[in-house]
């Protein structure tokens, strides 16, 4: 977890696809009776922006207390501010809830920079613009935090949507989505459409803007174009996937594919950037620099620190390459690729220059914990977290930012051999050695 990149701590195109097609979503996804791909009440239920996270409105307790909650597929705790904090407009007041139950247990979650800690309990939870159900869920009431909440972000808690294995304090604490599926008839699947603005938003615009959709229990066909392509969830902890090839403007980075997944590759809505392992990042930046060499930018830009500004409306998108990640397909020896544009990996930043300029940060960064497909990737696609079938689907998002010359793409199939070898096996700690 790295400050400025992992929320909430802030803080390439190859040859033509083969004739053969991968299995993909038709109308076979688990759905409630009578709900075949239309979830009108859940569409547009997210707000926010990639730099500070996307949040959904939730209610907690009896009577219901409304809070905005960050949607985070990179963690597994439902945790909410439960004490006054300078950056919180409101917080969960357990003493006002008749249905709150104290678990008499603390939880402490440290990050590389920052932390939060709190007290565990359960209460009744619902999502106003979600399924019409109420569930009793575990809640971490955050009583102390450092560099966790973001000034002006407008969210007061975090909804960890990953698996129990990475829940804190341990995997016995059932995550919210597990509770939802167990206690209701909601199918074990959710999908996310994160809509990057493509231009900076000031505070009032963010509050008024639509940030996307979290469809709980299904797939909404109006949120994507083309076909959904699925990649297996390698292991149910994070939403771990396997990348088998990387291209910049169609040029293969030609690295051992294990490097792309060292030590893992995950899909994480709570991370702003596309984060790449050190060797991969260096090769990718070298290739992006070469592709955009008609203009030169300072090293601080490529480090994601400095902003580069252009006259409003003149950002030279065409000089920046597209980036393609090939993902393991559902069929042996087949992969598919997702392609993002500079409109995804150059992140608009507000309030730094004049209104006559458009300013951006480079939103690809280095990681020491593997590849993280954060908002930069997700803003190009409609992403289906099909937990029931242990797979993640990608389709071109109906709201992705593009220009008249290029668009994000999901294409396949491609023949790729020995894809299993691309996965990195994290050494298991022999716990017995810790006893000595």
């Amino acid at each position: 977890t790295q400050h400025g990149i992992r929320l909430p701590l802030r803080s390439g195109l190859g040859g033509a696809p083969l004739g053969l097609r991968l299995p993909r979503e038709t109308d076979e996804e688990p759905e409630e009776p009578g709900r075949r791909g239309s979830f009108v009440e859940m569409v547009d239920n997210l707000r926010g922006k990639s730099g500070q996270g996307y949040y959904v409105e939730m209610t907690v307790g009896s009577p219901p207390q409304t809070l905005n909650i960050l949607v985070d597929t990179g963690s597994s705790n439902f945790a909410v501010g439960a004490a006054p904090h300078p950056f919180l407009h409101r917080y969960y007041q357990r003493q006002l809830s008749s249905t709150y139950r104290d678990l008499r247990k603390g939880v402490y979650v440290p990050y590389t920079q920052g932390k939060w800690e709190g007290e565990l309990g359960t209460d009744l939870v619902s999502i106003p613009h979600g399924p019409n159900v109420t569930v009793r869920a575990n809640i971490a009431a955050i009583t102390e935090s450092d560099k966790f909440f973001i000034n002006g972000s407008n969210w007061e808690g975090i909804l960890g949507l990953a698996y129990a294995e990475i829940a804190r304090p341990d995997d016995s604490l059932e995550p919210f989505f597990d509770s939802l599926v167990k206690q209701t008839h909601v199918p074990n699947l959710f999908s996310l459409q994160l809509c990057g603005a493509g231009f900076p938003l000031n505070q009032s615009e963010v509050l008024a803007s639509v940030g996307g959709s979290m469809i709980i229990g299904g797939i909404d066909h109006s949120l994507y174009t083309g076909s959904l392509w699925y990649t297996p969830i390698r292991r149910e902890w994070y939403y771990e996937v396997i990348i088998v090839r990387v291209e910049i403007n169609g040029q293969d980075l030609k690295m051992d594919c294990k490097e792309y997944n060292y030590d893992k590759s995950i899909v994480d809505s709570g991370t702003t950037n596309l984060r790449l392992p050190k060797k991969v990042f260096e090769a990718a930046v070298k290739s992006i620099k070469a592709a955009s060499s008609t203009e030169k930018f300072p090293d601080g830009f490529w480090l994601g620190e400095q902003l580069v500004c252009w006259q409003a409306g003149t950002t030279p998108w065409n000089i920046f390459p597209v980036i393609s990640l090939y993902l393991m397909g559902e069929v042996t020896n087949q992969s598919f690729r997702i392609t993002i544009l500079p409109q995804q990996y150059l992140r608009p930043v507000e309030d730094v220059a004049t209104s006559q300029d458009d300013c951006y940060k480079f939103a690809i960064s280095q990681s020491s914990t593997g590849t993280v497909m954060g908002a930069v990737i997700m803003e190009g696609f409609y992403v289906v977290f099909d937990r029931a079938r242990k797979r993640i689907g990608f389709a071109v998002s109906a709201c992705h930012v593009h220009d008249e010359f290029r668009t994000a793409a999901v294409e396949g199939p491609f023949v790729t051999l020995d894809m299993e070898d691309c996965g990195y096996n994290i050494p298991q700690t022999d716990e017995s050695t810790l006893m000595t």
Partner: antibody, heavy 120, light 108 residues
Framework: QLQLQESGPGLVKPSETLSLTCTVS??????????WGWIRQPPGKGLEWIGN???????YYNPSLRSRVTISVDTSKNQFFLKLSSVTAADTAVYYC????????????WGRGTLVTVSS | EIVLTQSPATLSLSPGERATLSCRAS??????LAWFQQKPGQAPRLLIY???NRATGIPARFSGSGSGTDFTLTISSLEPEDFAVYYC??????????FGGGTKVEIK
Amino acid sequence: QLQLQESGPGLVKPSETLSLTCTVSGGSISSSSYYWGWIRQPPGKGLEWIGNIYYSGSTYYNPSLRSRVTISVDTSKNQFFLKLSSVTAADTAVYYCARLGHGYNYFDLWGRGTLVTVSS
Amino acid sequence: EIVLTQSPATLSLSPGERATLSCRASQSVSSYLAWFQQKPGQAPRLLIYDASNRATGIPARFSGSGSGTDFTLTISSLEPEDFAVYYCQQVYVWPPRTFGGGTKVEIK
């Protein structure tokens, strides 16, 4: 060592176009390590950035001057140029050309400057 | 737009004294800040870049510090040739565009 020298008329009439040349000697303007820029300083006042150019011709301008400024480059002559149209007395200043080094971030080498007065 | 405010506007000191000049940014510029020295009738000269790195040929008595919004240029012991106007400039927003208003260091 590398030197920069501004040249051009010291007097320009209001509403006309100010034209200056910066000649780079002792090194190549086509170096991929640098941008080249113009900065001005009205008498007794502070510094104002005008714009930059890369040898490929890629330009960046100060938004407040953008509608009136053109910066261009001639790599064969090792020169870059400033044109500022529709000048007024407020454009009277010492005009400096400079090299943007240290990873395209800092003006690390400057010309001596040339005073341009706008007056009829 | 990021605004750089330098203080004091004028600093009256004697040779041998320590000079402390301040530059404050209206929002964080990380460490992307430079200091320039300008003597009458001359072009500015780069003293410090990236907030604390001395440019080539700059004497050790000049030092820069700070990050985020607050920066300081310190001249440990003023020499006669140090009496000049000093400007800060941020390059967090690129291309570099914003200069401070300047601090004049004059002989007391």
